[in-house]
């Protein structure tokens, strides 16, 4: 048997991310005998479920089963049959379901109940569906990126796996942007916190981490847009909204009932003399930026320093990984390069937003118009959130790394969630075994 590797015992895990705008299924695998090592779990598949987020199925709960079928069947194909029964399946729902629960706990429970019944029909080890808290979402995102970057490993490497990985063990902060919420999580320089609600303590691989985290509900990119429209229509003189966040020549009719459907626009709700209004794009970055800033209340802060809306934010520290919609939007706009300064990003956004809608449609013919129309707003919103909301500066901008994947695994909360629920992140540093199962003998 000289130089023959013994067959590895591989384990699998499945996590469904039930986000506000869509659901994605992630399949992870790892060698069983190394499950307490850092960095051994990796993603083998992502399956995006066709359709919107599960909260939209509140009136059609009997369709949840077919909605999830293709991705669950894909998991059945990818994972060897012999492993099905021991493969855990977790579903975590985020801000879309948090908002539904705010409207009706009964309806949210009904959706989750049908989801659970549907997922229980598969041959996997279903571990439940739940709405995770914003704090969990932030914490698990932070764990994911630092796990994948090797920040919890005690072994120092002479090589770097990813361009922005340094050999130091300083953790990265995590910036996550979804459709309905956004999270900021990092280890501040000062260990003491003024706001216990935003403090988390972890002991991972023998090291203590005091982490700051906050999730801003209603400040995901989709809900922020609804907020902005609800705010701006208040002062419109008629049913035409000239909007600087959309390209010149862009037109779209919005139902007032849709605008006020979400709890996120409640603070702007008023009786309007029309049932519909038309957005008419004028494509002006500076004016769009000003409009977005009005969503952040910075006039009140009961702490030494705040982000916005009176929420404590300690001084920013170290490098940050910005993922999910931070990455998707900036990647579309071709602004993820480490070399692009904040000033250059702003300049590019000004240019992009001012381009006529017809020109944009021609340049990006393959992109669905619904998404295409919102990149000007989303890019502007990201800049406003990072600079004015979180107080990044032109200098600290270079510490933000827009990350889609790290070593083939998506940056996001799902991996951290699974690592935690499968007890794969030990509190203490595991003792290294002289020979692992896959060692050459």
């Amino acid at each position: 048997t000289q130089n023959k590797a013994l067959p590895e015992n591989i384990k699998y895990g499945i996590v469904l991310d039930a986000g506000s705008s869509h659901t994605s299924l992630y399949i992870y695998k790892w060698p069983a005998e190394k499950e307490n090592d850092t960095g051994v779990v990796h993603q083998v598949e992502e399956c995006r479920v066709k359709g919107p987020g599960i909260s939209k199925y509140v009136q059609k709960v009997n369709e949840i089963g077919i909605y999830l079928t293709d991705c669950m069947e894909r998991a059945r194909e990818v994972i060897p049959r012999s492993q099905h029964q021991e493969t855990p399946v977790y579903l975590g729902a985020t801000a879309g379901m948090r908002l539904l629960r705010m409207e009706s706990e009964e309806l949210a429970d009904r959706v989750l109940d049908v989801v659970e019944r549907s997922l229980s029909n598969y041959p996997f080890d279903f571990q439940g569906a739940r709405i995770i808290t914003g704090q969990e979402e932030g914490a698990y995102g932070w764990i994911t990126i630092n796990y994948l970057l090797g920040k919890f490993s005690q072994k120092t490497r002479w090589f770097s796996i990813v361009p922005y990985e340094t050999n130091n063990q300083e953790t990265f902060g995590a910036l996550d942007l979804g459709g309905a919420s956004t999270q900021i999580t990092f280890v501040p320089q000062n260990q003491t916190t003024e706001s216990p609600d935003n403090a988390l303590q972890f002991r991972l691989y023998g090291k203590d981490y005091n982490v700051y985290t906050h999730s801003f509900l209603c400040y995901g990119k989709d809900q922020a847009l609804w907020q902005k429209l609800a705010k701006d229509i208040q002062v419109a003189s008629n049913e035409i909204l000239r909007d600087p966040c959309f390209h010149p020549g862009y037109k779209k009719v919005v139902n007032v009932s849709d605008l006020y459907k979400t709890p996120c626009t409640k603070r702007f709700e008023m009786t309007l003399p029309f049932q519909q209004f038309e957005i008419q794009g004028i494509g002006n970055y500076q004016q769009c930026h000003q409009s977005v800033l009005e969503l952040f209340n910075t006039s009140y802060c009961p702490y030494s320093q705040c982000a916005f809306n009176g929420i404590f934010l300690p001084p920013l520290q170290g490098d940050f990984g910005a993922f999910s919609a931070f990455y998707f939007v900036m990647n579309f706009l071709n602004l993820t390069s480490e070399k692009v300064s904040q000033e250059k990003v702003t300049e590019m956004m000004k240019k992009f937003c001012s381009q006529p809608w017809e020109e944009i449609k021609t340049s990006y013919a393959g992109v669905k118009e619904k998404y295409l129309s919102e990149y000007c707003f989303s890019g502007t919103y990201i800049l406003s959130l990072l600079l004015q909301g979180y107080h990044f500066t032109a200098d600290s901008w270079e510490h933000i790394h827009f990350i889609g994947k790290i070593q083939g695994s998506d940056a996001g909360w799902t991996l951290g969630y699974m690592l935690n629920l499968t007890n794969m992140i030990p509190a203490e540093q595991p003792l290294s075994t002289p020979l692992s199962h896959s060692t050459y003998v």
Partner: nanobody
Framework: EVQLLESGGGLVQPGGSLRLSCAAS????????MSWYRQAPGKERELVAA???????NYADSVKGRFTISRDNSKNTVYLQMNSLRAEDTAVYYC??????????????????WGQGTQVTVSS
């Protein structure tokens, strides 16, 4: 615009079988979801069985193990094989073709086509 025409309904004794067909006038290859719904008198329309473009299926608990949905894209047809029929299966059966919208706003479905329905009566 896709038109759907159901056939195969009728009167059958309890324990008997029927095969419903749904012929589409357009190309169903591009339609992601095809399903059968039913509506009994005085009751809400309910989803019986559905099939995706990849051929994956899903059934209401009440028909699991008795009904089988299938699709033949070359014939632009969807079938519902109904075995071990019971009196409570009596209803008008409707064929439905749809796709979900990926959007967070507006309608859940991007498009939604329905047939006229075919009556199934299970009685001795």
């Amino acid at each position: 615009e896709v038109q759907l025409l159901e056939s195969g309904g009728g009167l059958v004794q309890p324990g008997g079988s029927l095969r419903l067909s749904c012929a589409a006038s357009g190309d169903i290859f591009s339609i992601n979801y095809m399903s059968w719904y039913r509506q009994a008198p005085g009751k809400e329309r309910e989803l019986v069985a559905a099939i995706t473009g990849r051929g994956n299926t899903n059934y209401a608990d009440s028909v699991k193990g008795r009904f089988t949905i299938s699709r033949d894209n070359s014939k632009n047809t969807v079938y519902l094989q109904m075995n071990s029929l019971r009196a409570e299966d009596t209803a008008v059966y409707y064929c439905n073709a749809w796709d979900y919208s990926d959007y967070d706003e507006g309608p859940l479905r991007e498009y939604d086509y329905w047939g006229q329905g075919t009556q199934v009566t299970v009685s001795s």
